[in-house]
Interface confidence: low
């Protein structure tokens, strides 16, 4: 005889950690190894993320949650959920196709990631260079000589750094 179909989707009874197995009359089967379902009612389990190569496992996969990766030492995470790893460089360097390269003269990078950025042009603000820039540090601008009056010794700190990785505007 033909069995009456349930008005309610029988798969909705399957909890997280299982999947609704259409090949077995829609019974709830546990997720196979290396897979997970984070919500109930799923018809498949998702393959666990594998933290291979430059990725390392921060949290193991379980039947109800995916693995979480971070990066091996010398690399840093990029993207939501550490979707990519990028090589660290030293301060004073930037990452290029050929690896870490020193910042060119007139540019600096004070972080292990991102690109070298030009030193602040003090003269654009009518100021003079108080402390020279290096590969690792921006210049420090001070008042122009004409601005100095007896007893005046104030120092203007460098402009706030742009967000890491931004190229010059």
């Amino acid at each position: 005889f033909e069995r009456t179909r349930s008005l309610q989707d029988p798969c909705s009874n399957c909890p997280a950690g299982t999947f609704c197995d259409n090949n077995r009359n829609q019974i709830c089967s546990p997720c196979p190894p290396n897979s997970f379902s984070s919500a109930g009612g799923q018809r498949t389990c998702d393959i666990c993320r594998q933290c291979k190569g430059v990725f390392r496992t921060r949290k193991e996969c379980s039947s109800t949650s995916n693995a979480e990766c971070d990066c091996t030492p010398g690399f840093h995470c990029l993207g939501a959920g550490c979707s990519m790893c990028e090589q660290d460089c030293k301060q004073g360097q930037e990452l290029t196709k050929k690896g870490c390269k020193d910042c060119c003269f007139g540019t600096f990078n004070d972080q292990k990631r991102g690109i070298c950025r030009p030193w602040t042009n003090c003269s654009l603000d009518g100021k003079s260079v108080l402390v020279n820039g290096t590969k690792e540090r921006d210049v420090v601008c001070g008042p122009s000589p004409a601005d100095l009056s007896p007893g005046a010794s104030s120092v203007t700190p460098p402009a706030p750094a742009r967000e890491p990785g931004h190229s010059p505007q």
Epitope: I47, Q50, L78, A80, S83, M84, C85
Partner: antibody
């Protein structure tokens, strides 16, 4: 449902800049990074870079470093891509794409024509 | 950068045919490969991620396989709406790179 809506077509002269916007809806904007991909007429897909929408930190493809700036405004769930010093070979459709293990949702594309 | 070499660059097929597109990475990319479908004048659409997982709403006739350097997209029974260009993409490392595309045309 997830939607990415981009700004309209632009015509620019060589040497000018263009800024394309990408407004996200249907999900939490800062949970997913946003990538930018372009496609010249009759050509394949070229990755330009991406922005971490949570921190604002961008990562640029080498071919675009120094010419591209990617930003975002979390208050209006919008990502921006600005390309400067435009050349005729920058004529292309520019796409934004949300990223979750892959570029799972794409904007409709913005045609940028560079012509003197 | 990792190169993704797709083949063939184009193919002609009929409705109902089984179609196979291959993508070869220049180095091991684990299972970090996605496949996209693009129709003329439209944005690409994600079909497959993690080499073999179908994206939400993608018909079961689309399947992906492979790991390491060799990957395959298979359309088990080509439908009229499947005539399009297909791209593979690796996301194992920055920059993510695309294959050159495979145009599936009507025979």
């Amino acid at each position: 449902q997830v939607q990415l809506v981009q700004s309209g077509a632009e015509v620019k002269k060589p040497g000018a800049s263009v800024k394309v916007s990408c407004k996200a809806s249907g999900y939490t904007f800062t949970d997913y990074s946003m990538h930018w991909v372009r496609q010249a007429p009759g050509q394949g897909l070229e990755w330009m870079g991406w922005i971490n929408t949570e921190t604002g930190e961008p990562t640029y493809a080498d071919d675009f470093k120094g010419r591209v700036t990617m930003t975002r405004d979390t208050s209006i769930s919008t990502a921006y891509m600005e390309l400067s010093r435009l050349r005729s070979d920058d004529t292309a459709v520019y796409y934004c794409a949300r990223y979750d293990y892959a570029m799972d949702y794409w904007g409709q594309g913005t045609l940028v024509t560079v012509s003197s | 950068d990792i190169q993704m070499t797709q083949s063939p660059s184009s193919l002609s097929a009929s409705v109902g045919d089984r179609v196979t597109i291959t993508c070869k990475a220049s180095q091991d990319v684990s299972s970090a490969v996605a496949w996209y479908q693009q129709k003329p004048g439209k944005a690409p659409k994600l079909l497959i991620y993690w080499a073999s997982i179908r994206h939400t709403g993608v018909p079961s006739r689309f399947s992906g396989s492979g790991s390491g350097t060799d990957f395959t997209l298979t359309i088990s029974s080509l439908q009229p709406e499947d005539f399009a260009t297909y791209y593979c993409q690796q996301r194992y490392t920055t920059p993510p790179t695309f294959g050159g595309g495979t145009k599936v045309e009507i025979k």
